[in-house]
Structure formats: C-alpha cells, structure tokens
Interface confidence: low
C-alpha cells in the first residue's frame, strides 16, 4: 500500500496522578496520486480473434485494475469491434479520482492485411520485395497505420520494402508488424529463398577443327547450378544453336563447311522462376580445306578452224584459300595443252585441224583440285588450205 504508519511515544497523566506511559500508533496517509496521473502513459496491445473477428485490448499495467462500465478481466478488455472507439474508465485502490479515461482506438481487422511477395521473377535471384496489401476495406483512418520491417539488422518503416544485391540461393528472414496509432496489432514473418542465379561462364578447354567438315569443342562446366547448355555456332550470317545435356563436356560438330570460319558460343542456362542464361564463352576455328566443287556451265566454241574459246562458271564451293582455273586439252591420250588462269576464260589457238580434242576444266583452291568438267570438241579441216595449192600445167 502507498499509505504508511509512523509510531510515536506520548506521556499523559492519569486521574490518580500517577504517570502512565502509553504507546499509540497514529496512521498518517500521504496524498495518493490520481488514477488519471498514475495511468497517464498506459500502453495497450491488441489481440485479434479470427473466429469472432473481435479484438481484446491488453492493458500493460502491473496491478489488476477496474474498468468502470466495461468489464475487464485480468487487465483485458474483450469484444472490441474493429475501427470503433471504446472508452474505458481505469481505477484502482492505489489512486484517487479522477479515473483515467482511456480511449481505445480499435485497429482494423487483421485479416484485412496480407503480406505479399512482390518480387519480380526476373530479379528474384538477387532481390526481395515484400509489401503489405489491404485486401478488404475498413473505416479506420489509414493515416494512423504504420508499417515496420526488420530483415536481418536492417529496419524499414515502409509499407513496401525492396532488398537488392542479395546472394542467389540464400534464405533471408524478414519480420514485419503493423501498428495502429503506434499500437502493434498484427505481425508476420517470412523466410524467402532467393532464386537460382545465372550460371557462371563455362571454361572452354579447346575448340578446333582438324578436318574439312568437323570441329570439336571441350569445356569445363560452370560452378553454379544449371540445367543445360546452349551451343551456338555462327558462320557468316547463319547461326545454329543446339541445346546440350548438362553432363556433356565435349561436342563434335559435324557437317561443317570446309575452309570456313566458325565462331562458337557456349552458355549454361537454368530454368528457375524464369530462364536465366549464364555468360557465354566464345571461341572460333577455321575448318580445313577440301576439294572444290565442279566448275559449271562450261562451253567450248570455235573461233577459227583450229582455235577454241573455253569458258566456265566458278564452282559453288571453293573450299580453300586460292582461286585458279586449269584447262587441260588432250588429243587421244596425249596432253597437248595445260593452261592456268585467274578466270575461267581460255583461248586455245593453233590446234591440229580435223582433230578430236578433250577439254577438261577444273578449279584449284591452292590445296585441292576439283572434279574436272569434260567436253569433247573437234577442230575443222583447214578451210583456207585451197588458197595455198599451186596448180602446175
């Protein structure tokens, strides 16, 4: 009790004249504080009942107080409706009138708020977004609602938070609470695991071509999780891309074009919340030479009785570094001419008259000859021969 007793000794005379010493105890009560003063800074916690959709206000006091008209049990005021004010008159025998009039400003219903993961899937490997959403209307003044988040040692007083530059595949715990007029009325905790990150870059060990139509690439896989590889190879403007099994560390490229530069790119990817591609490792090689294809549209035309004009079109596939056209002229099985030009345009003069010739034109790319295009053509008899005859009489 706040009242306290003081003991004092007094001497009085009795009627007989003898002195009698008696001890009396006098209670002196210093003034009690008013309940209004005593409970001026009382704090309240609100507890929500999801079944009844009503709140209980828990009064943070050390003694069991009385609540006037509102009954309170164990310092709890029950059955409070959301967003409605309730007035509670708080008294106790340790304080005097006037009582503390406490206005309970009841918060909105807890289920009207939902903690929502607002992380963009594209960025879910390194960011977390959390946001309180109002999913139903209420009549409370939204100005009086404040939000608080704590993620690790970071504290935010926002309705929405965005954490950036996080580690992929890591768990982060965030606690959050909502306060109404600075009274906490709901909280939530979320453990969020960031998404798989982009895989690292594969390490190409070698990438080469040792034949005209084949190449090979070998690599070490990246360290981080991934599902598959994509291998692309580009020749000139044509790009081929192939999905490869994650367990492969080597791929043989077939059906390549001879003497052609191929640029290869290899990246790993993972299909997580979205597909994430790792950085591509690049390399290139040039395939070996091969025989060129045949020249085409070859023509042999006579320019005189014993002269020919041989022409042809370039091969479709040169397949090598250089460009040279060859013409072989045979009579019977005897090679009578062997010419080489930059262009397929040959003028063959001074052949034998009235003779069958075989003309073989082919392309040489510096490494290989192509298949010859073969035409047969005969020279004429010498139409000018009669001018040279002398008649003797």
């Amino acid at each position: 009790s706040d009242a306290y007793l003081n003991a004092s000794e007094t001497t009085t005379l009795s009627p007989s004249g003898s002195a009698v010493i008696s001890t009396t105890t006098i209670a002196t009560t210093p003034s009690k504080p008013t309940c209004d003063e005593k409970y001026a800074n009382i704090t309240v916690d609100y507890l929500y009942n999801k079944e009844t959709k009503l709140f209980t206000a828990k009064l943070n006091v050390n003694e069991n107080v009385e609540c006037g008209n509102n009954t309170c049990t164990n310092n709890e005021v029950h059955n409070l409706t959301e967003c409605k004010n309730a007035s509670v008159s708080i008294s106790h025998n340790s304080c005097t009138a006037p009582d503390k009039t406490l206005i309970l400003d009841v918060p909105p219903g807890v289920e009207k708020f939902q903690l929502h993961d607002c992380t963009q899937v594209e960025k879910a490997d390194t960011t977390i977004c959390l946001k309180w959403k109002n999913i139903e209307t209420f009549t409370c003044d939204t100005q009086n609602i404040t939000y608080r988040f704590q993620c690790g040692n970071m504290i935010f007083d926002n309705k929405e938070i965005k954490l950036e530059n996080l580690e992929p595949e890591h768990e982060y715990k965030c606690d959050s609470e909502i306060l109404y007029n600075n009274h906490k009325f709901t909280n939530a905790s979320k453990i969020i695991k960031t998404d798989f990150g982009s895989p690292g870059e594969p390490q190409i060990i070698f990438c080469r071509s040792e034949a005209a139509h084949q190449g090979v690439i070998t690599w070490n896989p990246p360290q981080r999780s991934f599902h598959n590889f994509t291998l692309c190879y580009i020749k000139e403007t044509e790009k081929d891309c192939l999905n490869l099994d994650k367990n492969l560390i080597k791929y043989d490229l077939q059906n390549l074009k001879p003497y052609t530069k191929y640029v290869l790119s290899l990246h790993a990817y993972i299909i997580a919340k979205v597909q994430r591609n790792g950085s591509a490792a690049m390399c290139h090689f040039t395939t070996k030479s091969a025989p060129p294809s045949q020249v085409w549209n070859m023509t042999v035309s006579m320019t005189s009785d014993n002269s020919m004009h041989v022409k042809c079109r370039p091969p479709r596939d040169r397949n090598g570094p250089h460009e040279r056209y060859h013409l072989e002229v045979e009579a019977g099985n005897t090679l009578v001419r062997n010419e080489s030009h930059k262009n397929c345009d040959f003028r063959v003069k001074d052949l034998q008259y009235s003779t069958d010739y075989t003309f073989k034109a082919y392309f040489h790319n510096g490494d290989y000859p192509g298949e010859p295009f073969i035409l047969h053509h005969s020279t004429s008899y010498n139409s000018k021969a009669h001018h040279h005859h002398h008649h003797h009489h």
């Epitope: 994509t230 044509e238 790009k239 081929d240 891309c241 192939l242």
Partner: nanobody, 127 residues
Amino acid sequence: QVQLQASGGGLVQAGGSLRLSCAASGRTVSSDAMGWFRQAPGKEREFVAAINWNGASTYYGDSAQGRFTISRDNAKNTVYLQMNSLKSEDTAVYYCAASDWVVGGISLMNGAEYKYWGQGTLVTVSS
C-alpha cells in the same frame, strides 16, 4: 518423352492443296526446331521443310521451294505444312520431327539432327 502425331494427309488431285499438322504431346516443343521429311516408296528419306523455335527462320528443300509453307503455333504445340500446287511426285509418307536445335541452317536439313519422329501421314497426289 515427346510424341508427335502427324495428320492431314489424304488423296488429292494434281494442282490441289493439303495442310498437314503435327501435334506434340509429352512435353513442350516450343524451344525446339521442327521439320517435315518425306519418303516415297523405294526412295531415300528427303528433307522438305524446317522451322526454327520461334518461327523466325524457315528452311525448304529443293522440292518444296515456292510451293510449300511451314509454320508453327507454339501455344498449341503444333507445326503445319501447307502444300500447294501438288504434283504426282509429291506422293509420299510425310513425317514430322523435333530437333534439339533451337535454330539451324544446314543442320536442320539433316534427318540425323532430329531426336523425335512422328508416325507419318500418307499424301497421294493423283494425276
């Protein structure tokens, strides 16, 4: 495992048209290149047409050039072959196939580059 179901074949007069469809089930083929091949009785299998994963690139064999059109609908997991100005030499069993290739040039003309094959649909062109 992917199952490919080709349909739309039948008997048609020379000069007529047909549209073949190939529906994939078992898994999505939206990231795969798709192709059509054909095999006439007693002949080698022949490349007809191919299309890359998103339809941006198409490839045609010599026989199909200018007359046939390949297309795809990734939402339906289906690839189509529209065949116009049909000739008797187009008579064959037409097969659709799915490749691991996402895009492809020369690679898509090679049957060996295709992983999954349909059961084929017969096209008969009468003169």
